[in-house]
Interface confidence: medium
C-alpha cells in the first residue's frame, strides 16, 4: 500500500534537516522566522571567528573545506595555473616564514608609496621635495589598486556598455560607513579602536626601524588622520543619495573636470590631467584634456576642496599610506596581525581570527577564481545539475513574463519592453567550460604571475599590481560580455545590469538550494526563488534603468515609471519599519535595501507560481516523513531556512549601514507578509503578524 510518504534516504535527509532547523511549537502565522529557524537558533552558537552565522555561512564554511582539500595536495599532473594556485596557498599558510620576517616586507614597500610620515624619520627631507598629490594618490591607485581621496577607476560606460570609460568617484573609508565617523554612542568604540590600531602599527614600524617612539606624537598624528578622514566621510554622499544610476552618471571631459572641480593641495593647484596620466601611463595609455570621464560624485569633489586646503602634505600622506597599510597588516607577522584585534572586535564582534587555512583558501579563490574553480568543480560539482537548472531558469523567466500581464500599474508599451529585456537575459550556470577543458587559456590567464612559497607578502603585492594593471588596460578595449562576473567556487548568485546576465555558480547549486535528488518543492523554494531574485534584479530600482543590451537608457513611459516608484515606496516603508534588536533597535534602511527587497518578493512569487505550474503538469509530490506539512508549505519552509542565522551585535551595527540586503529574519518576514499564497498555505487569519492586510507588490 502507498501512504503517499517518500521514504528514500534523500527524502529522510531533507526531512531531518527541515525538522532540526524548525521549531514546530511556534505558531507559523505569528513569527515564521522563529517557526522555520527556532531549532537552528537553539542548536547553534556563532563561532568566535564569525561575525554572523547562518545556513548560508555554513555552506560557505563547507566550501572552504573543499578548497583546502584541493589546494593543499600537489599533484604531478597539475597544469601550471593550478600549480601556481597551490603555491600561492602554501605561501599563505606558511606562518613560520611570515612570522620570521616581522614587518620587513612592508618596510621595504613603504618608500614606493612616499613613506608613512608618522613612521619615518625626517619625512619632509626624504619625500617632501618630490611629493605631489597627483603622484602620491596616483601611485597607490595605479600600482596597488588602492583608491584614496579620489577614486579613479576604469569601468563599463553605463550608457554605452560595450565600451570602458574612466570614472571618478568618492573613495571608500577606513571604517565601514560614513556613519561611524560620528564616533559617539554605538560608534565610539570603533573610532577609538581605529585610532589605536593606527598608533599600534606606527609604533611597531618605528620599533622595527629602530626609531625613537614618542607616544604623544603618534597619538597627535593619528588623531589628525582621524580628523581628516572624518571630514572626508562627511563630504561623501550617503548611499541613499547614490541609488539612481541616471543621477550618478555625469559625463564630462577632463578639461571640464579641471574647470568644475579645481583643487588646491599643499598650496599647489591640482592637475587632473597630470593625475590621470600618472595613473594611465603605467599601462602605456596617454590621456588628453579631451578624454571623456564619468563623474559619479560631483558633490563630493566640490566639498573636498576646502578640506584639502587645510591639511599639509604630511597629514594627507599619513592618511593615504595608512589606508593601504591597514589592508596589509593581516599579511604580516603575528605581532602585526594582533595589532588589529581590538579593531576587528569593534567592527565584527569576533574575538578570534579566522583560521589561517580558511583565510588562505578564500584569498586564493578570490585572486585565482578560474584555477580554483577548476579544482572545485572537479571535486564537488555534479555536471548534470546544469541541465536541470537551465530548465528551471526557462520556467521562471516564462512566469516572470506571464506575470507582467497581471500588473495593473504598468502600461502595455512598458510591459512589451520588459518582456524583451527578460527574454534577452543571458544565463551562466555552474562554471565556464573553458576552465576545465582549455588548459592553455587557463595557463595564459596567470602567465605573468610567479609566486614564491616563502614570500607571501610579495605574492600579495604581485596580485594587486597584476589585477590593477589588467583593469586599467581595459580603457581602450571593448567590454567582453561573455566573461563571467563570478568564479565557480562561490556560494552566491548574481545579476549584472551592464551585461543583462544572471549567474548561478557551482557553489550555490547544492542543498538546501538545489539537488536533483530532493523534492521539487524544496528546489523551487530554494534555487527557484534565487533564480527569480536574480531575474527581478533586472527590474529593481537600479536594474530597471538599463535596457536589454545593458545600456543606461530610459525605456519606461513616464506613467509607468511614476507608478513603479509608488509601488516601491510601499516596500521602503514596510522594511524601514522593521527595528533590529541586534543593532540596538535601529530601523532598517528601506531605501538602501529596496533593490534586494524587490528581488526577494518578486523572486519568491515567481518561484511559487512556477512550482504550481510544475504540480499541474506532473501531479503532487510524495510528502516528506515526520513532517505534517504539504509541499506548498514545504516550499515556504525551505525558502525561509536558507536565511536561518544570527549576527553579533557589532556586525549588526555594521551591516545595517553597509549591507544592501535586509538581515535574514526580515528577508523571511517581509517577503512572506506580502505573500497571499503563503498565508493561504499556512491558513493565517487576516491581520495576524504574518498576514497584514496591506501587502506590497512590485513584480
Amino acid at each position: 500500500y502507498d501512504d503517499g510518504i517518500c521514504k528514500s534516504s534523500d527524502c529522510i535527509k531533507s526531512a531531518a534537516r527541515l525538522i532540526q532547523n524548525m521549531d514546530a511549537t511556534t505558531e507559523p502565522c505569528t513569527d515564521f522566522f522563529k517557526y522555520a529557524c527556532g531549532g537552528w537558533l537553539k542548536r547553534n552558537v556563532i563561532p568566535e571567528t564569525s561575525s554572523r552565522y547562518g545556513n548560508f555561512d555554513i555552506l560557505r564554511d563547507e566550501l572552504e573545506v573543499v578548497l583546502k582539500d584541493v589546494l593543499q595536495e600537489p599533484k604531478t599532473e597539475d597544469i601550471v595555473a593550478v600549480q601556481k594556485a597551490k603555491a600561492l596557498y602554501r605561501s599563505c599558510i606558511n606562518e613560520s616564514a611570515i612570522d620570521s620576517r616581522g614587518g620587513e616586507p612592508l618596510l621595504k614597500l613603504l618608500p614606493d608609496i612616499y613613506g608613512w610620515p608618522v613612521a619615518t624619520e625626517n619625512w619632509e627631507q626624504k619625500y617632501g621635495a618630490s611629493w605631489t598629490a597627483e603622484k602620491a594618490i596616483a601611485q597607490l591607485n595605479s600600482k596597488y589598486g588602492k583608491k584614496v581621496l579620489i577614486n579613479l577607476f576604469v569601468g563599463t560606460d553605463d550608457k554605452n556598455s560595450v565600451n570602458h570609460v574612466i570614472h571618478i568617484d568618492q573613495p571608500r573609508l577606513g571604517l565601514p560607513s560614513r556613519d561611524y565617523y560620528e564616533c559617539t554612542g554605538i560608534y565610539k568604540e570603533a573610532c577609538t579602536a581605529y585610532v589605536d590600531f593606527m598608533i599600534s602599527v606606527a609604533r611597531l614600524i618605528r620599533q622595527e626601524e629602530r626609531l625613537p617612539i614618542d607616544e604623544n606624537q603618534l597619538a597627535l598624528e593619528m588623531n589628525k588622520v582621524m580628523e581628516l578622514e572624518k571630514e572626508i566621510a562627511n563630504a561623501t554622499a550617503k548611499p541613499e543619495d547614490r541609488n539612481d544610476p541616471m543621477l550618478l552618471y555625469n559625463k564630462m571631459t577632463l578639461a571640464q573636470i579641471q574647470n568644475n572641480f579645481s583643487l588646491e593641495i599643499n598650496g599647489k593647484p591640482f592637475s587632473w590631467l597630470n593625475f590621470t596620466n600618472e595613473i594611465m601611463s603605467t599601462v602605456n595609455i596617454s590621456i588628453t584634456n579631451e578624454e571623456d570621464v564619468v563623474v559619479y560624485a560631483p558633490e563630493y569633489l566640490t566639498k573636498l576642496k576646502p578640506i584639502l586646503t587645510k591639511y599639509s602634505a604630511r597629514d594627507l600622506q599619513n592618511l593615504m599610506s595608512w589606508r593601504f597599510i591597514m589592508d596589509l597588516v593581516s599579511s604580516l607577522s603575528r605581532t602585526y596581525k594582533e595589532s588589529r584585534n581590538a579593531f576587528r572586535k569593534a567592527l565584527y564582534g569576533t574575538t578570534s581570527e579566522t583560521a589561517t587555512w580558511r583565510r588562505c583558501a578564500n584569498y586564493v579563490n578570490g585572486n585565482m577564481e578560474n584555477a580554483v574553480g577548476r579544482l572545485y568543480v572537479e571535486a564537488a560539482f555534479a555536471g548534470e545539475s546544469k541541465h536541470v537548472v537551465e530548465d528551471l531558469i526557462a520556467q521562471i523567466r516564462e512566469v516572470f513574463i506571464q506575470t507582467l500581464d497581471d500588473l495593473t500599474w504598468m502600461d502595455a508599451e512598458t510591459k512589451k519592453r520588459a518582456e524583451e529585456k527578460a527574454l534577452a537575459i543571458k544565463e551562466r550556470i555552474g562554471y565556464p567550460d573553458d576552465i576545465v577543458s582549455n588548459d592553455n587559456k587557463l595557463n595564459n590567464e596567470y602567465l605573468e604571475l610567479n609566486y614564491k612559497e616563502d614570500e607571501y607578502f610579495e605574492n600579495i603585492i604581485q596580485n594587486l599590481k597584476f589585477s590593477q594593471s589588467k583593469q586599467l588596460k581595459k580603457l581602450r578595449e571593448k567590454v567582453d560580455k561573455d566573461e563571467w562576473i563570478s568564479g565557480a567556487a562561490v556560494v552566491n548568485a548574481f545579476y549584472s545590469s551592464g551585461r543583462n546576465q544572471i549567474v548561478f555558480p557551482a557553489g550555490i547549486l547544492q542543498p538546501p538550494f538545489f539537488s536533483a535528488q530532493q523534492s521539487n518543492s524544496l528546489n523551487y523554494g530554494g534555487i527557484g526563488m534565487v533564480i527569480g531574485h536574480e531575474i527581478t534584479h533586472g527590474f529593481d530600482d537600479n536594474g530597471r534603468n538599463f535596457n536589454k543590451d545593458g545600456d543606461l537608457v530610459d525605456w519606461w513611459t513616464q506613467q509607468s515609471a511614476s507608478n513603479f516608484k509608488e509601488q516601491s515606496q510601499c516596500m521602503v516603508y514596510q522594511y524601514g519599519n522593521f527595528s533590529w534588536d541586534l543593532a540596538g533597535g535601529q530601523h532598517l534602511n528601506g531605501i538602501n535595501t529596496l533593490g534586494e527587497n524587490i528581488a526577494d518578493n518578486g523572486g519568491l512569487g515567481q518561484a511559487y507560481r512556477a512550482y504550481q505550474n510544475y504540480i499541474k503538469k506532473n501531479g503532487e509530490e510524495k510528502l516528506l516523513p515526520g513532517l505534517d506539512l504539504n509541499h506548498k508549505q514545504l516550499f515556504f519552509l525551505n525558502f525561509a531556512q536558507v536565511w536561518c542565522g544570527t549576527y553579533r551585535p557589532e556586525y549588526a551595527v555594521n551591516s545595517i549601514k553597509t549591507d544592501v540586503h535586509s538581515p535574514g529574519n526580515f528577508r523571511i518576514i517581509g517577503t512572506l507578509q506580502n505573500s497571499a499564497e503563503f498565508s493561504e498555505a499556512f491558513h493565517c487569519r487576516k491581520n495576524s503578524y504574518m498576514n497584514p492586510e496591506k501587502k506590497c507588490r512590485v513584480w
Epitope: 619632509e124 627631507q125 614618542d214 607616544e215 604623544n216 606624537q217 597627535l220
Partner: nanobody
Framework: QVQLQESGGGLVQPGGSLRLSCAAS????????MYWVRQAPGKGLEWVSA???????YYTDSVKGRFTISRDNARNTMYLQMDNLKSEDTGVYYC????????????????????????WGQGTQVTVSS
C-alpha cells in the same frame, strides 16, 4: 644623529627669571613633541612641560602660570621662560623627545625614569637661592 643641547641655566634669586633654550639637530624638529624634565637634588626625574607640533602647551601643576614653553621651528629651538622662580625649582633641567608615555601618565605618575624618553640633552643647572 639626534642631538639636544640645553643652555640658559644659572643662579637666580627667588622671584627672578631665567630663559632656558634647547637647540635640536639630527631630526625634523617641527615634526616632534618636545619636553622639559627636571631633577631636583637627591630627587627623581619630574616632568615640567611639553609642547606639541602645533604649539599647544602642557604644564605640571606646580609651574602653571609661572613657566611658558615655546618653540621656534625655523631655528630648531625650544624655550622655557621661567618667571617668579622658587627655591623648589632648583635642579638640572633637561630637554627631551620621543616620550614613551602619555602626558596624562606623566602628570599622574609624578616621577619618571630615563627610559620614558628616547632622547635627552645633557642638562642645564638652575639654582634658585637668596
Amino acid at each position: 644623529q639626534v642631538q639636544l643641547q640645553e643652555s640658559g641655566g644659572g643662579l637666580v634669586q627667588p622671584g627672578g627669571s631665567l630663559r632656558l633654550s634647547c637647540a635640536a639637530s639630527g631630526f625634523t624638529f617641527s615634526s616632534y613633541w618636545m619636553y622639559w624634565v627636571r631633577q631636583a637634588p637627591g630627587k627623581g626625574l619630574e616632568w615640567v612641560s611639553a609642547i606639541n607640533t602645533e604649539g599647544n602647551t602642557y604644564y605640571t601643576d606646580s609651574v602653571k602660570g609661572r613657566f611658558t614653553i615655546s618653540r621656534d621651528n625655523a631655528r630648531n629651538t625650544m624655550y622655557l621662560q621661567m618667571d617668579n622662580l622658587k627655591s623648589e625649582d632648583t635642579g638640572v633641567y633637561y630637554c627631551a623627545k620621543d616620550a614613551k608615555i602619555l602626558i596624562a601618565r606623566m602628570r599622574s605618575q609624578g616621577r619618571l625614569s630615563r627610559s620614558d624618553f628616547g632622547s635627552w640633552g645633557q642638562g642645564t643647572q638652575v639654582t634658585v637661592s637668596s
